[in-house]
């Protein structure tokens, strides 16, 4: 059998026998364009493509539409994989989304959506989610039905305000909605009563800014 040399996601990499977490090169569907991603091969059976990670505030997440489209940061640390790649990938097959959260008191929680995809850029990378389970709230902290993506230079929310400018970061803002994992990073003891922080309302409330977050996707049939 011929060895596979290009991979569309971390699940394919895992199934090829490469089972160590780290940075790998992925290829856009139906293209030769490449992108570097962090693959988590340890959590829940492995094969997870990490599409977002926050841990220390080292990367500025108040970025432009183009930057969120193409991705930014470092896959070894804080980064955003890129809306265009994720849209193309999740449009090809059914994917699940796992969101892992850490607070400043040593607690961890997660939300798992059994179907996740992003619409194309023509639909402002609108998020689609179904089937929530997990420990980070019984109600989805990403507004349902899904919202369009907004950035500081592309206001697609449903507020008379500009959510991205005010809350910081690009996100699927509603008006402005119960979450923003791309908000301003606040260190410990400065992380409460901050509406523009890293928020997951149905776990920690409106003013609590989280310590660390990871968004990762994997094929539903993995």
């Amino acid at each position: 059998k011929e060895e596979q040399t290009t991979f569309r996601d971390c699940a394919e990499i895992f199934k090829s026998g490469l089972t160590t977490s780290g940075i790998y090169t992925l290829t856009f569907p139906n293209s030769t364009e490449e992108i570097k991603a962090y693959c988590d091969m340890d959590v829940g059976g492995g094969g997870w493509t990490v599409i977002q990670h926050r841990e220390d505030g080292s990367v500025d997440f108040q970025r432009t539409w183009k930057e969120y489209k193409e991705g930014f940061g470092s896959p070894l640390g804080e980064y955003w994989l890129g809306n265009e790649f994720v849209s193309q990938l999740t449009g090809q097959h059914r994917y699940v989304l796992k969101i892992q959260l850490k607070d400043w008191e040593g607690n961890e929680a997660h939300s798992l959506y059994d179907h996740f995809y992003l619409a194309g850029e023509e639909s402002n990378y609108r998020i689609h989610l179904t089937g929530l389970t997990g420990t980070a709230g019984k109600i989805s902290s990403i507004s349902q039905p899904g919202s369009d993506f907004s950035t500081k230079d592309s206001d697609n929310d449903k507020c008379i305000c500009k959510c991205s400018q005010m809350l910081s970061g690009g996100w699927w803002f509603d008006a402005c909605g119960p979450s923003n994992l791309n908000g301003q990073y606040y260190p410990q003891k400065q992380n409460t009563n901050k509406f523009n922080g890293i928020k997951w309302y149905y776990w920690k409330g409106s003013g609590y800014s989280l310590k660390a977050t990871t968004m990762m996707i994997r094929p539903a049939d993995f």
């Epitope: 008379i160 005010m166 008006a175 301003q184």
Partner: antibody, heavy 122, light 112 residues
């Protein structure tokens, strides 16, 4: 389109009661904190009361504490203000107002009802 | 309670001319998140108030760009670059940093 439609105002004698209602539409009512603000004839604006999205947090102005009760019914998309022991100085146009931002972020009012006049007079 | 003081209380303006309203607070309105919890509202004759500026300097959607807000801490200003007839009404500043929220006395803008 966001709409806040008020009802329940009128003329009432001092010491009596009145209940104001505010029917919300065009947005997810259960996600927003709500307020009552009043304006005495020819005067400025005065905040009266606040209730959080779930109803778990409530605040009152000192001038109405113990006499007014704010409540909400998220199933009916409605906000209420029960006003007891009314005084002449409570005469005002009462406005319901929605927080600018959802999920109990208190920064100000994004939308206002049309107002309802409460006149307390013997 | 935080006391909000506006000036002037009356502001006659010629159409096409600029206008400026000052608002001072008895305590700083600068939150640790970097925002000033100061909003501006306009109440046109016979109407409910409407939001113009939120968090000090952010113009609400649908508000003409001739309106701008500035300032930080305790001193804030609402500017209208070119006053139009439809801008008449009473302008209020409001602080949302502490409960109870409090308003300025209002500034009545009228056309000369």
């Amino acid at each position: 389109e966001v709409q806040l439609v008020q009802s329940g105002g009128g003329v009432v004698q001092p010491g009596r009661s009145l209940r104001l209602s505010c029917a919300a539409s065009g947005f997810t009512f259960s996600s927003y904190g709500m307020h009552w603000v009043r304006q005495a004839p020819g005067k400025g604006l005065e905040w009266v009361s606040y209730i959080s999205s779930s109803g778990s947090t409530i605040y009152y102005a000192d001038s109405v504490k113990g006499r007014f009760t704010i409540s909400r019914d998220n199933a009916k998309n409605s906000l209420y203000l029960q006003m007891n022991s009314l005084r002449a100085e409570d005469t005002a146009v009462y406005y319901c107002a929605r927080d600018l931002l959802d999920y109990d972020i208190l920064t100000g009012y994004g939308y206002w009802g049309q107002g309802t006049l409460v006149t307390v007079s013997s | 309670d935080i006391v909000m003081t506006q000036s002037p209380l009356s502001l006659p303006v010629t159409p096409g001319e600029p206008a400026s309203i000052s608002c001072r607070s008895s305590q700083s309105l600068l939150h640790s998140n970097g925002y000033n919890y100061l909003n501006w509202y306009l109440q046109k004759p016979g109407q409910s108030p409407q939001i113009l500026i939120y968090l000090g300097s952010n113009r609400a959607s649908g508000v003409p760009d001739r309106f701008s807000g500035s300032g930080s801490g305790t001193d804030f200003t609402l500017k209208i670059s070119r006053v139009e007839a439809e801008d008449v009404g009473v302008y209020y500043c409001m602080q949302g940093l502490q409960t109870p929220p409090t308003f300025g006395q209002g500034t009545k803008l009228e056309i000369k």
